[in-house]
Interface confidence: low
């Protein structure tokens, strides 16, 4: 079953290569287990950036070496992606799945265009 997912259209990463955005979903029921996946679309190729399954009210748990972190509050997920470089500029899509209890719902946002600008190297001081 389809579900609406909203996310900001554009986000600019900070000078340390970190970008944060909110992914909000319109839950049709009271889900207790939610899976959030961040996908990146660039050059017509879609790739998975990170994914986490969490119990409502608990922290999101990503893989140990994931570049993503996140917190949840109600039907909102606050996502942070770290370690971004200019080459990582692209459309980052939030996919939300309500895993439990049935029925299963899935929604995909329109994507957040994340712009990453590599910082200029500091000039050598003589």
């Amino acid at each position: 079953k389809a579900m609406h997912v909203a996310q900001p259209a554009v986000v600019l990463a900070n000078s340390r290569g970190t970008a944060s955005f909110v992914c909000e979903y319109a839950s049709p029921g009271k889900a207790t287990e939610v899976r959030v996946t961040v996908l990146r679309q660039a050059d017509s190729q879609v790739t998975e950036v990170c994914a986490a399954t969490y119990m409502m009210g608990n922290e999101l748990t990503f893989l140990d070496d994931s570049i993503c972190t996140g917190t949840s509050s109600g039907n909102q997920v606050n996502l942070t992606i770290q370690g971004l470089r200019a080459m990582d500029t692209g459309l980052y899509i939030c996919k939300v799945e309500l895993m439990y209890p049935p029925p299963y719902y899935m929604g995909i946002g329109n994507g957040t265009q994340i712009y990453v600008i590599d910082p200029e190297p500091c000039p050598d001081s003589d």
Epitope: T37, R40, A51, L63
Partner: nanobody
Framework: EVQLVESGGGLVQPGGSLRLSCAAS????????MAWFRQAPGKEREFVSA????????AYADSVKGRFTISRDNSKNTLYLQMNSLRAEDTAVYYC??????????????????WGQGTLVTVSS
């Protein structure tokens, strides 16, 4: 160092099914994308399917789409390939591989750093 050991190959009749497994050792295997490739006799090795580190994304060659299903169990460090509706042209040595990226599902051999020894699948009546 990553080690990959495939199993599950064998002789099967056309229309039959097989499930290949690839047991991986090493942390890189569970945190990186993995793939299946195959090499038929006298042909070049070709991409079959790939799956991202967490299993959220999969990719398939057109020739196997709808018949093969890739999956992984990171708790067991194992990659799987469920092959249904097998055809004679699926006969090949099947290799599993670990990519150097966590999320990118590459279709070319040089994007994969570690390879298994392969398991032979023969589809014949």
């Amino acid at each position: 160092e990553v080690q990959l050991v495939e199993s599950g190959g064998g002789l099967v009749q056309p229309g039959g099914s097989l499930r290949l497994s690839c047991a991986a050792s090493g942390r890189t295997a569970s945190s990186n994308a993995m793939a299946w490739f195959r090499q038929a006799p006298g042909k070049e090795r070709e991409f079959v399917s790939a799956i991202s580190a967490t299993g959220g994304l999969t990719a398939y060659a057109d020739s196997v789409k709808g018949r093969f299903t890739i999956s992984r169990d990171n708790s067991k460090n194992t990659l799987y390939l469920q092959m249904n509706s097998l055809r004679a042209e699926d006969t090949a040595v099947y290799y599993c591989a670990v990519g150097r990226e966590r999320w990118y599902l590459r279709h070319t051999e040089n994007e994969y750093d570690y390879w298994g020894q392969g398991t032979l699948v023969t589809v014949s009546s």
